[in-house]
């Protein structure tokens, strides 16, 4: 019974960007300004969503699809589809409730966004500090100690930087 | 419809002062941390000052600290920024914003935007 009653629903035949108008014994009726549907068979279209304020319109609102934004310079896009922004810190510091503040002592960021990650523990891997860290840059870790004797190869290209996030404290 | 309106906004001489207002609707006010940001004449957005859901946490960027005063009303859903001696380097369009879903747990991102209201400092 449900099937055929759907074969026969006439709402069934309107197409993306329309409606099928109740009013207007269903028929289909396109979209208003400033709505969309992105399906057939709809019985109403949707608002469109509407990129104010810290958000940019990336793609203009159409019958059949919805506004994208995204965010103005000094922001990027959290979220799924662009939902929030978060304003950008300079590299060398972290957003918190009271702003961009500076990395403190032994940590780094060198991004925009984020939050400030501990250098790299060079000692762990048996290495040492080649580079030192600062506020922007983790440290580069060089040859041991062991490996800058006399005769020994005195230089070794860097060890990769261990994932920050798993840097001890 | 989840919304926000700044009024208040206005000409005033270099350290007069002025209350900006916020009226928010749609959504439950007291439940987000809320936010004003400014835009002077061909820069970009700045972040002035943000409070949590009770009020009992608010912050300034440095340049107004001391001057301007956040604040909120949950029972009448408003969000104000008082301004006092104000400068030239104040005027521009102030917003007020809502905090996401989340904010300050993981993030620190704003999801629903004014229109704004437009602060003018000239003798």
């Known amino acids: 019974f449900e099937r055929t009653r759907s074969l026969q629903d006439p709402c069934s035949n309107c197409p993306a960007g329309t409606f099928c108008d109740n009013n207007r014994n269903q028929i289909c009726s396109p979209c208003p300004p400033n709505s969309f549907s992105s399906a057939g068979g709809q019985r109403t279209c949707d608002i469109c969503r509407q990129c104010k304020g810290v958000f940019r319109t990336r793609k203009e609102c159409s019958s059949t699809s919805n506004a994208e934004c995204d965010c103005t310079p000094g922001f990027h896009c959290l979220g799924a589809g662009c939902s929030m922004c978060e304003q950008d810190c300079k590299q060398g510091q972290e957003l918190t409730k009271k702003g961009c503040k500076d990395c403190c002592f032994g940590t780094f960021n060198d991004q925009k966004r984020g939050i400030c990650r501990p250098w790299t523990n060079c000692s762990l891997d048996g290495k040492s500090v080649l580079v030192n860290g600062t506020k922007e840059r983790d440290v580069v870790c060089g040859p041991s100690p062991a490996d800058l004797s006399p005769g020994a190869s005195s230089v070794t290209p860097p060890a990769p930087a261990r994932e920050p996030g798993h840097s001890p404290q | 419809e989840v919304q926000l309106v700044e009024s208040g906004g206005g000409l005033v001489k270099p350290g007069g002062s002025l209350r900006l207002s916020c009226g928010a609707s749609?959504?439950?006010?007291?439940?987000?941390?809320m936010f004003w940001f400014r835009q002077a004449p061909g820069e970009g957005l700045e972040w002035v000052a943000n409070?949590?859901?009770?009020?009992?946490?608010?912050y300034y960027v440095d340049s107004v600290e001391g001057r301007f005063t956040i604040s909120r009303d949950n029972a009448k859903n408003s969000l104000y920024l008082q301004m006092n001696s104000l400068r030239a380097e104040d005027t521009a369009i102030y917003y007020c914003?809502?905090?996401?879903?989340?904010?300050?747990?993981?993030?620190?991102?704003?999801?629903?935007w004014g229109q704004g209201t437009t602060v003018t400092v000239s003798s």
């Open positions: 749609g959504f439950t006010f007291s439940s987000y941390w």
């Open positions: 914003a809502r905090g996401g879903d989340g904010y300050s747990d993981s993030h620190y991102g704003t999801d629903v």
């Open positions: 409070i949590n859901q009770d009020g009992s946490e608010k």
